[in-house]
Amino acid sequence: HKSSSQGQDRHMIRMRQLIDIVDQLKNYVNDLVPEFLPAPEDVETNCEWSAFSCFQKAQLKSANTGNNERIINVSIKKLKRKPPSTNAGRRQKHRLTCPSCDSYEKKPPKEFLERFKSLLQKMIHQHLSSRTHGSEDS
Protein backbone atom coordinates (compact mmCIF):
# COMPACT_ATOMS: atom_id res chain seq x y z
CA HIS A 1 0.00 0.00 0.00
CA LYS A 2 1.58 3.25 -1.21
CA SER A 3 0.83 5.53 1.74
CA SER A 4 2.01 3.02 4.34
CA SER A 5 5.23 2.37 2.39
CA GLN A 6 5.77 6.14 2.17
CA GLY A 7 5.27 6.31 5.93
CA GLN A 8 7.83 3.55 6.37
CA ASP A 9 10.22 5.40 4.08
CA ARG A 10 9.82 8.63 6.04
CA HIS A 11 10.48 6.64 9.17
CA MET A 12 13.65 5.14 7.74
CA ILE A 13 14.79 8.53 6.49
CA ARG A 14 14.56 9.59 10.13
CA MET A 15 16.79 6.62 11.00
CA ARG A 16 19.15 7.78 8.26
CA GLN A 17 19.30 11.20 9.93
CA LEU A 18 20.04 9.60 13.29
CA ILE A 19 23.17 8.02 11.80
CA ASP A 20 24.47 11.51 11.00
CA ILE A 21 23.73 12.65 14.55
CA VAL A 22 25.61 9.63 15.93
CA ASP A 23 28.52 10.50 13.61
CA GLN A 24 28.44 14.09 14.87
CA LEU A 25 28.56 12.88 18.49
CA LYS A 26 31.49 10.59 17.71
CA ASN A 27 33.51 13.76 17.01
CA TYR A 28 32.92 14.85 20.62
CA VAL A 29 33.42 11.50 22.33
CA ASN A 30 36.12 12.98 24.61
CA ASP A 31 33.58 15.52 25.87
CA LEU A 32 31.09 12.84 26.97
CA VAL A 33 30.86 11.45 30.49
CA PRO A 34 32.96 8.24 30.33
CA GLU A 35 30.13 6.16 31.76
CA PHE A 36 29.49 2.55 30.67
CA LEU A 37 26.12 2.20 28.92
CA PRO A 38 24.08 -0.82 27.72
CA ALA A 39 25.08 -1.26 24.08
CA PRO A 40 23.18 -3.95 22.14
CA GLU A 41 25.22 -5.82 19.55
CA ASP A 42 24.34 -8.68 17.16
CA VAL A 43 20.67 -7.98 17.87
CA GLU A 44 18.46 -10.93 17.00
CA THR A 45 15.87 -10.51 14.25
CA ASN A 46 12.63 -8.89 15.43
CA CYS A 47 14.33 -7.33 18.45
CA GLU A 48 15.73 -4.33 16.57
CA TRP A 49 13.14 -1.89 17.89
CA SER A 50 13.61 -3.14 21.42
CA ALA A 51 17.38 -2.63 21.09
CA PHE A 52 16.79 0.78 19.51
CA SER A 53 14.78 1.86 22.55
CA CYS A 54 17.65 0.68 24.80
CA PHE A 55 20.03 2.98 22.96
CA GLN A 56 17.56 5.85 23.27
CA LYS A 57 17.06 5.30 26.99
CA ALA A 58 20.78 5.20 27.78
CA GLN A 59 22.07 8.13 29.84
CA LEU A 60 24.56 9.55 27.39
CA LYS A 61 25.74 12.84 28.93
CA SER A 62 27.96 15.78 28.14
CA ALA A 63 30.92 16.18 30.50
CA ASN A 64 30.13 19.93 30.49
CA THR A 65 33.64 20.85 29.50
CA GLY A 66 34.69 23.32 26.85
CA ASN A 67 32.55 25.02 24.22
CA ASN A 68 31.05 21.86 22.71
CA GLU A 69 28.45 21.40 25.44
CA ARG A 70 25.57 22.96 23.50
CA ILE A 71 26.02 20.93 20.31
CA ILE A 72 26.48 17.74 22.35
CA ASN A 73 23.32 18.33 24.37
CA VAL A 74 21.27 19.18 21.27
CA SER A 75 22.58 16.07 19.51
CA ILE A 76 21.76 13.81 22.46
CA LYS A 77 18.27 15.31 22.66
CA LYS A 78 17.72 14.63 18.95
CA LEU A 79 18.85 11.02 19.37
CA LYS A 80 16.23 10.54 22.06
CA ARG A 81 13.36 12.02 20.07
CA LYS A 82 10.65 9.43 19.52
CA PRO A 83 10.53 8.38 15.86
CA PRO A 84 7.15 8.26 14.06
CA SER A 85 5.29 5.05 14.84
CA THR A 86 5.25 2.22 12.30
CA ASN A 87 3.56 -1.14 12.02
CA ALA A 88 6.92 -2.89 12.32
CA GLY A 89 7.64 -1.03 15.54
CA ARG A 90 4.19 -1.79 16.93
CA ARG A 91 4.52 -5.48 16.06
CA GLN A 92 7.84 -5.73 17.82
CA LYS A 93 6.50 -4.04 20.94
CA HIS A 94 4.40 -7.14 21.56
CA ARG A 95 7.39 -9.41 21.39
CA LEU A 96 8.21 -10.18 25.02
CA THR A 97 11.21 -12.42 24.41
CA CYS A 98 13.70 -9.66 23.57
CA PRO A 99 16.52 -9.10 26.07
CA SER A 100 16.06 -6.33 28.64
CA CYS A 101 18.29 -3.28 28.30
CA ASP A 102 20.23 -4.22 31.43
CA SER A 103 21.16 -7.59 29.99
CA TYR A 104 23.23 -6.04 27.20
CA GLU A 105 26.96 -5.55 27.63
CA LYS A 106 27.86 -2.08 28.88
CA LYS A 107 30.31 -0.06 26.85
CA PRO A 108 31.95 3.40 27.03
CA PRO A 109 30.51 6.19 24.82
CA LYS A 110 32.75 5.51 21.79
CA GLU A 111 31.72 1.85 21.45
CA PHE A 112 28.16 2.70 22.49
CA LEU A 113 27.85 5.13 19.55
CA GLU A 114 29.49 2.69 17.13
CA ARG A 115 27.02 -0.05 18.10
CA PHE A 116 24.09 2.37 17.85
CA LYS A 117 25.20 3.31 14.34
CA SER A 118 25.53 -0.37 13.38
CA LEU A 119 21.99 -1.06 14.54
CA LEU A 120 20.60 1.92 12.60
CA GLN A 121 22.44 0.76 9.48
CA LYS A 122 21.07 -2.76 9.94
CA MET A 123 17.51 -1.42 10.23
CA ILE A 124 17.90 0.66 7.06
CA HIS A 125 19.44 -2.33 5.26
CA GLN A 126 16.49 -4.53 6.26
CA HIS A 127 14.03 -1.87 5.12
CA LEU A 128 15.68 -1.26 1.76
CA SER A 129 16.22 -4.96 1.11
CA SER A 130 12.56 -5.75 1.72
CA ARG A 131 11.03 -3.21 -0.64
CA THR A 132 10.61 -3.03 -4.39
CA HIS A 133 12.88 -0.81 -6.46
CA GLY A 134 12.11 2.89 -6.70
CA SER A 135 13.04 5.65 -4.33
CA GLU A 136 11.27 7.25 -1.43
CA ASP A 137 9.12 9.29 -3.79
CA SER A 138 8.07 6.47 -6.08
Partner: antibody
Protein backbone atom coordinates in the same frame (compact mmCIF):
# COMPACT_ATOMS: atom_id res chain seq x y z
CA UNK B 1 7.04 17.38 -7.90
CA UNK B 2 10.08 18.18 -5.79
CA UNK B 3 11.90 21.34 -6.82
CA UNK B 4 14.81 23.28 -5.35
CA UNK B 5 15.21 26.76 -6.81
CA UNK B 6 18.52 28.61 -6.57
CA UNK B 7 19.50 31.98 -8.05
CA UNK B 8 21.80 31.61 -11.04
CA UNK B 9 24.81 33.74 -10.06
CA UNK B 10 26.37 36.13 -7.56
CA UNK B 11 29.32 38.48 -8.09
CA UNK B 12 31.02 39.51 -4.85
CA UNK B 13 34.10 41.40 -3.72
CA UNK B 14 36.98 39.69 -1.90
CA UNK B 15 36.53 39.89 1.87
CA UNK B 16 32.77 40.32 1.55
CA UNK B 17 30.01 37.82 2.39
CA UNK B 18 27.28 36.30 0.27
CA UNK B 19 24.00 34.71 1.34
CA UNK B 20 22.46 32.36 -1.19
CA UNK B 21 19.00 30.84 -1.12
CA UNK B 22 17.40 27.51 -1.98
CA UNK B 23 13.61 27.55 -2.17
CA UNK B 24 12.01 24.12 -1.76
CA UNK B 25 8.62 23.02 -3.04
CA UNK B 26 6.70 19.80 -3.72
CA UNK B 27 7.34 18.12 -0.36
CA UNK B 28 7.16 18.70 3.40
CA UNK B 29 10.18 20.95 3.96
CA UNK B 30 10.77 19.90 7.57
CA UNK B 31 10.82 16.14 6.81
CA UNK B 32 14.13 16.19 4.96
CA UNK B 33 17.53 17.58 5.81
CA UNK B 34 19.12 19.96 3.32
CA UNK B 35 22.73 19.48 2.26
CA UNK B 36 25.05 21.94 0.53
CA UNK B 37 27.78 20.99 -1.93
CA UNK B 38 30.57 23.01 -3.57
CA UNK B 39 31.94 22.51 -7.08
CA UNK B 40 34.95 24.48 -8.27
CA UNK B 41 35.25 25.01 -12.06
CA UNK B 42 36.15 21.72 -13.74
CA UNK B 43 36.44 19.98 -10.37
CA UNK B 44 34.60 17.38 -8.32
CA UNK B 45 32.00 17.81 -5.60
CA UNK B 46 32.79 18.79 -2.01
CA UNK B 47 30.33 18.43 0.86
CA UNK B 48 29.87 21.59 2.96
CA UNK B 49 27.30 20.59 5.55
CA UNK B 50 23.67 19.89 6.33
CA UNK B 51 20.77 21.42 8.22
CA UNK B 52 17.61 19.95 9.70
CA UNK B 53 14.87 22.45 8.77
CA UNK B 54 12.67 21.29 11.65
CA UNK B 55 14.99 22.74 14.32
CA UNK B 56 18.00 24.36 12.60
CA UNK B 57 20.35 21.59 13.75
CA UNK B 58 23.53 21.79 11.66
CA UNK B 59 26.51 19.59 10.89
CA UNK B 60 29.48 21.08 9.03
CA UNK B 61 32.43 19.59 7.23
CA UNK B 62 35.62 20.49 9.11
CA UNK B 63 36.77 22.30 5.95
CA UNK B 64 33.84 24.74 6.08
CA UNK B 65 33.53 25.48 9.80
CA UNK B 66 33.78 29.26 10.13
CA UNK B 67 33.34 29.70 6.37
CA UNK B 68 29.72 28.58 5.86
CA UNK B 69 26.65 29.20 8.02
CA UNK B 70 23.47 27.28 7.22
CA UNK B 71 20.01 28.54 8.18
CA UNK B 72 16.41 28.02 7.12
CA UNK B 73 13.20 30.00 7.01
CA UNK B 74 10.49 27.43 7.64
CA UNK B 75 7.66 29.82 6.72
CA UNK B 76 8.92 30.18 3.14
CA UNK B 77 10.46 26.67 2.87
CA UNK B 78 13.80 28.25 2.05
CA UNK B 79 17.29 27.17 3.06
CA UNK B 80 20.15 29.65 3.10
CA UNK B 81 23.90 29.47 3.12
CA UNK B 82 26.05 32.41 4.16
CA UNK B 83 29.68 32.35 3.02
CA UNK B 84 31.95 34.84 4.75
CA UNK B 85 35.41 36.41 4.20
CA UNK B 86 35.34 35.44 0.55
CA UNK B 87 38.51 34.78 -1.44
CA UNK B 88 39.14 33.52 -4.98
CA UNK B 89 39.11 29.96 -3.54
CA UNK B 90 35.40 30.43 -2.85
CA UNK B 91 34.60 31.03 -6.53
CA UNK B 92 32.50 27.99 -7.35
CA UNK B 93 29.02 26.66 -8.00
CA UNK B 94 27.10 25.89 -4.80
CA UNK B 95 24.31 23.33 -4.84
CA UNK B 96 21.62 22.62 -2.29
CA UNK B 97 20.31 19.05 -2.21
CA UNK B 98 17.52 17.36 -0.31
CA UNK B 99 18.61 14.27 1.61
CA UNK B 100 16.38 11.24 1.89
CA UNK B 101 18.33 7.98 1.57
CA UNK B 102 20.71 9.99 -0.65
CA UNK B 103 20.86 13.50 -2.11
CA UNK B 104 17.77 12.76 -4.13
CA UNK B 105 16.92 16.21 -5.54
CA UNK B 106 19.37 18.99 -6.36
CA UNK B 107 19.04 22.67 -7.09
CA UNK B 108 20.50 24.06 -10.32
CA UNK B 109 23.33 25.65 -8.36
CA UNK B 110 24.38 29.23 -7.69
CA UNK B 111 27.59 30.34 -9.37
CA UNK B 112 29.61 32.59 -7.06
CA UNK B 113 32.40 34.69 -8.56
CA UNK B 114 34.74 36.46 -6.16
CA UNK B 115 36.41 39.35 -7.96
CA UNK B 116 37.33 42.96 -7.43
CA UNK C 1 37.61 10.82 5.98
CA UNK C 2 36.58 8.07 3.57
CA UNK C 3 38.23 8.47 0.16
CA UNK C 4 36.37 7.41 -2.98
CA UNK C 5 38.46 6.69 -6.06
CA UNK C 6 37.06 6.61 -9.58
CA UNK C 7 40.14 5.36 -11.41
CA UNK C 8 38.82 6.23 -14.86
CA UNK C 9 38.44 10.01 -15.18
CA UNK C 10 37.15 9.85 -18.75
CA UNK C 11 35.66 7.12 -20.87
CA UNK C 12 34.79 6.92 -24.57
CA UNK C 13 32.00 4.63 -25.75
CA UNK C 14 29.65 4.20 -28.68
CA UNK C 15 25.87 4.55 -28.58
CA UNK C 16 24.32 1.19 -27.69
CA UNK C 17 27.41 0.07 -25.73
CA UNK C 18 27.36 -1.40 -22.26
CA UNK C 19 29.43 0.88 -20.01
CA UNK C 20 30.69 0.20 -16.49
CA UNK C 21 32.08 2.88 -14.19
CA UNK C 22 33.82 1.84 -10.99
CA UNK C 23 34.30 3.41 -7.57
CA UNK C 24 36.52 2.17 -4.75
CA UNK C 25 36.20 3.27 -1.11
CA UNK C 26 39.13 3.50 1.30
CA UNK C 27 37.16 1.39 3.80
CA UNK C 28 34.06 -0.80 3.93
CA UNK C 29 31.00 1.41 3.43
CA UNK C 30 28.37 -1.32 3.85
CA UNK C 31 26.51 -0.54 0.61
CA UNK C 32 25.90 3.11 1.54
CA UNK C 33 27.01 4.18 -1.93
CA UNK C 34 25.10 6.48 -4.27
CA UNK C 35 25.59 7.45 -7.94
CA UNK C 36 24.87 10.85 -9.50
CA UNK C 37 24.82 12.13 -13.06
CA UNK C 38 25.92 15.67 -13.91
CA UNK C 39 24.92 16.69 -17.42
CA UNK C 40 26.97 19.22 -19.47
CA UNK C 41 24.59 22.03 -18.42
CA UNK C 42 25.51 21.37 -14.77
CA UNK C 43 22.29 19.64 -13.70
CA UNK C 44 22.86 16.97 -11.04
CA UNK C 45 20.53 13.99 -10.66
CA UNK C 46 20.50 10.99 -8.36
CA UNK C 47 20.55 7.73 -10.32
CA UNK C 48 21.19 4.96 -7.79
CA UNK C 49 21.15 4.91 -4.00
CA UNK C 50 22.20 2.25 -1.53
CA UNK C 51 24.39 0.52 -4.17
CA UNK C 52 21.60 -0.81 -6.39
CA UNK C 53 18.29 0.99 -5.73
CA UNK C 54 17.05 2.87 -8.79
CA UNK C 55 15.79 6.37 -8.00
CA UNK C 56 12.31 7.15 -9.26
CA UNK C 57 12.15 8.19 -12.91
CA UNK C 58 15.62 6.80 -13.74
CA UNK C 59 15.64 4.54 -16.83
CA UNK C 60 16.15 0.84 -16.13
CA UNK C 61 19.25 0.74 -18.34
CA UNK C 62 21.08 2.11 -15.29
CA UNK C 63 22.05 -0.38 -12.61
CA UNK C 64 24.41 -0.51 -9.67
CA UNK C 65 26.23 -3.27 -7.84
CA UNK C 66 29.00 -3.90 -5.36
CA UNK C 67 29.77 -4.43 -1.69
CA UNK C 68 32.46 -3.70 0.87
CA UNK C 69 34.83 -1.27 -0.81
CA UNK C 70 34.15 -1.92 -4.53
CA UNK C 71 31.14 -0.58 -6.40
CA UNK C 72 30.10 -0.05 -10.00
CA UNK C 73 27.51 1.70 -12.13
CA UNK C 74 26.47 0.06 -15.40
CA UNK C 75 24.64 1.62 -18.34
CA UNK C 76 23.40 -1.30 -20.41
CA UNK C 77 22.56 0.44 -23.67
CA UNK C 78 24.23 3.84 -23.96
CA UNK C 79 22.06 6.68 -25.27
CA UNK C 80 23.00 10.19 -26.35
CA UNK C 81 21.35 11.70 -23.27
CA UNK C 82 23.68 9.65 -21.02
CA UNK C 83 26.67 11.78 -22.04
CA UNK C 84 27.58 13.28 -18.70
CA UNK C 85 29.93 13.03 -15.73
CA UNK C 86 29.14 10.37 -13.13
CA UNK C 87 30.03 10.71 -9.45
CA UNK C 88 29.87 8.16 -6.66
CA UNK C 89 29.22 9.33 -3.08
CA UNK C 90 29.40 7.52 0.23
CA UNK C 91 26.67 7.90 2.83
CA UNK C 92 28.30 5.69 5.44
CA UNK C 93 30.20 8.21 7.54
CA UNK C 94 30.46 11.96 7.92
CA UNK C 95 31.81 13.92 6.19
CA UNK C 96 29.99 12.94 3.01
CA UNK C 97 32.59 12.39 0.29
CA UNK C 98 32.43 12.06 -3.49
CA UNK C 99 34.53 10.31 -6.09
CA UNK C 100 36.43 12.51 -8.55
CA UNK C 101 33.98 11.77 -11.34
CA UNK C 102 34.07 9.84 -14.63
CA UNK C 103 33.31 11.83 -17.77
CA UNK C 104 31.53 9.76 -20.41
CA UNK C 105 32.02 10.76 -24.04
CA UNK C 106 30.86 9.43 -27.39
CA UNK C 107 33.44 7.76 -29.65
Amino acid sequence: QVQLQQPGSELVMPGASVKMSCKASGYIFTDYWMHWVKQRPGQGLEWIGTIDPSDNYTIYSQNFKGKATLTVDESSSTAYMLLSSLTSEDSAVYFCARYGFAMDYWGQGTSVTVSS
Amino acid sequence: DIQLTQTTSSLSASLGDRVTISCRASQDISNFLNWYQQTPDGTVKLLIYYTSRLHSGVPSRFSGSGSGTDYSLTISNLEQEDIATYFCQQGHTLPRTFGGGTKLEIK
